[in-house]
């Protein structure tokens, strides 16, 4: 079907006073919500830095790329994007930096083509376990999401609920097994102290996982074994001290993997020997020549690849009677 070129929705920025007059009506094919910019030729609507407090009701049906960044949405209710007829083409939705602190169950329901979702830079104190799955069924309908960007969504300390932030995020990722098709997951800059052990096993399609700039101390209980499609694993700028044999073997067994480990406080003692041996042999670590020791003090800034077993000693543990106070 040929769209009429003469009356196609051109770039437009609607006058604010029109909003109330049309918001209750079904959207016209070529209208643009107040305070937004629209291009049907680019299938894009941008409502950026406009201090919007709710999602516009009169979004054009052609929208494939929707930018609602830099607003003051606060709460994303159930069916926030549900329209009649539905926004059947919406594929990429960017809500970053819009002061969202609550995303309710079913917020993204009725978006059958939604492939990319960015909620970054929102202080998400309350992310419903069913935000992405839409229902509390043990097995939900598969979500079409392929990329989920959740960088810097940790709220300030005083706004957090009395529960684990990591647990809240993981519950939303795993609910109803809806995100089995997810290929890219970004969770950078969220102050994560740990990664719940079951999260990766239930996201088998992952190609790209970004956990950079968190506070992860250990990967001991995290299994990468099922992530046979994983291509990139970003672990830069965490608090990792050492990677143990089990983790090293699992990473080495992934056929397409590239691992990024820069800027972690590696502890170069006897427990590091296996990792150093592995680093010298593996091709999976990008920039492995940049990895340096942080502790103990005598080893600070030593390059891991240049260490040998004689460098990696552990101070003997003194029996209690010989320990000094």
């Amino acid at each position: 079907s040929s769209s009429p070129t003469s009356s196609a929705s051109s770039f437009s920025s609607s006058a604010p006073f029109l909003a109330s007059a049309v918001s209750a009506q079904p959207p016209l094919p070529d209208q643009c919500p107040a305070l937004c910019e629209c291009s049907e030729a680019a299938r894009t609507v941008k409502c950026v830095n406009r201090n919007l407090t709710e999602v516009p009701t009169d979004l054009p049906a052609y929208v494939r790329n929707l930018f609602l960044t830099g607003n003051q949405l606060a709460v994303l209710p159930a069916g926030a994007f549900a329209r009649r007829p539905p926004l059947a083409e919406l594929a990429a939705l960017n809500l970053s930096g819009s002061r969202l602190d609550e995303v309710r169950a079913g917020a993204f329901e009725h978006l059958p083509s939604l492939r990319q979702l960015d909620l970054s830079h929102n202080p998400l104190a309350d992310l419903s376990p069913f935000a992405f799955s839409g229902s509390n069924a043990s097995v939900s309908a598969p979500s079409p999401l392929v990329e989920l960007i959740l960088n810097h969504i940790v709220p300030p300390e005083d706004e957090r609920q009395n529960r684990s932030f990591e647990g809240m995020v993981v519950a939303a990722l795993l609910a109803g097994r809806a995100l089995q098709g997810l290929r890219r997951l970004e969770l950078a800059s969220n102050h994560f102290l740990y990664l719940p052990r079951d999260v990766l096993a239930q996201l088998p399609s992952l190609r790209h996982l970004d956990l950079s700039n968190n506070s992860l101390v250990s990967l001991t209980y995290v299994s990468f074994r099922n992530l046979t499609h994983l291509e990139s694993l970003h672990l830069e700028d965490n608090a990792l001290k050492v990677l143990h044999n089990g983790t090293l073997a699992e990473l080495q067994g992934l056929p397409h993997i590239r691992v990024f480990l820069d800027n972690n406080p590696w502890v170069c003692d006897c427990h590091m020997a296996d990792m150093v041996t592995w680093l010298k042999e593996t091709e999976v670590v990008q920039g492995k020549d940049r990895l340096t020791c942080a502790y103990p003090e005598k080893m600070r800034n030593r390059v891991l690849l240049e260490l040998n077993s004689a460098d990696l000693d552990c101070d003997p543990i003194l029996p209690p009677s010989l320990q000094t106070s």
Partner: antibody, heavy 122, light 107 residues
């Protein structure tokens, strides 16, 4: 990495129909908008039209009465037909893709075919 | 249709110099504008999309700016391989249109 390979007749007589096909390799066919663009010798670029995965088309008004763009999703191919050609249609014809669904979405054609030189001469 | 006017038509500079190319639209195109580079006998190559975002693999010396009707492509320090023809293109409205091009030549 998506690649486009195009082919079709390079020498036409006036009043004949230009017919070009572009095959898509290595990518999701449904994610893109498929365009045809032409460039007369020594001149700039002219957009002919585009089609999306659903078959929805948009054409340049200056060529609309003569142009048909179609898609064959089973073969991952899309085609251009331009009827009643004249010498003014002599140009290099490019197929190109714009991905409308990637997070780093492009407003430009980010993948191009190699170009087919079409000469219209009696 | 939206007319894009590029200036200058030809720009003569030496390697290492800074190049500034302009594109003006006959009506607002928001940020729905792309820049391409074309070398003789080759298809155009996308440099910048959405007015200011570098496409994958494009060197950092290329930058785009502008919104509405006035746009600029800047090449901070010209390399020998940068001498080519540059086109702007809008995707705000159908028909999609290109500027007439700016030829960047070696002085």
């Amino acid at each position: 990495q998506v690649q486009l390979q195009q082919w079709g007749a390079g020498l036409l007589k006036p009043s004949e129909t230009l017919s070009l096909t572009c095959a898509v390799y290595g990518g999701s066919f449904s994610g893109y908008y498929w365009s045809w663009i032409r460039q007369p010798p020594g001149k700039g670029l002219e957009w002919i039209g585009e089609i999306d995965h659903s078959g929805s088309t948009n054409y340049n008004p200056s060529l609309k009465s003569r142009v048909t763009i179609s898609v064959d999703t089973s073969k991952n191919q899309f085609s251009l037909k331009l009827s009643s050609v004249t010498a003014a249609d002599t140009a290099v014809y490019y197929c190109a893709a714009w991905f409308g669904e990637l997070w780093d979405y492009y407003y430009g054609m980010d993948v191009w075919g190699q170009g087919t030189t079409v000469t219209v001469s009696s | 249709e939206i007319v894009l006017t590029q200036s200058p038509a030809t720009l003569s500079l030496s390697p290492g110099e800074r190049a500034t190319l302009s594109c003006r639209a006959s009506q607002s195109v928001s940020s729905f504008l792309a820049w391409y580079q074309q070398k003789p006998g080759q298809a155009p190559r996308l440099l910048i999309y959405d007015a200011s975002n570098r496409a994958t693999g494009i060197p950092a010396r290329f930058s785009g700016s502008g919104s509405g009707t006035d746009f600029t492509l800047t090449i901070s320090s010209l390399e020998p391989e940068d001498f080519a023809v540059y086109y702007c293109q809008q995707r705000s409205n159908w028909p999609l249109t290109f500027g007439q091009g700016t030829r960047l030549e070696i002085k």
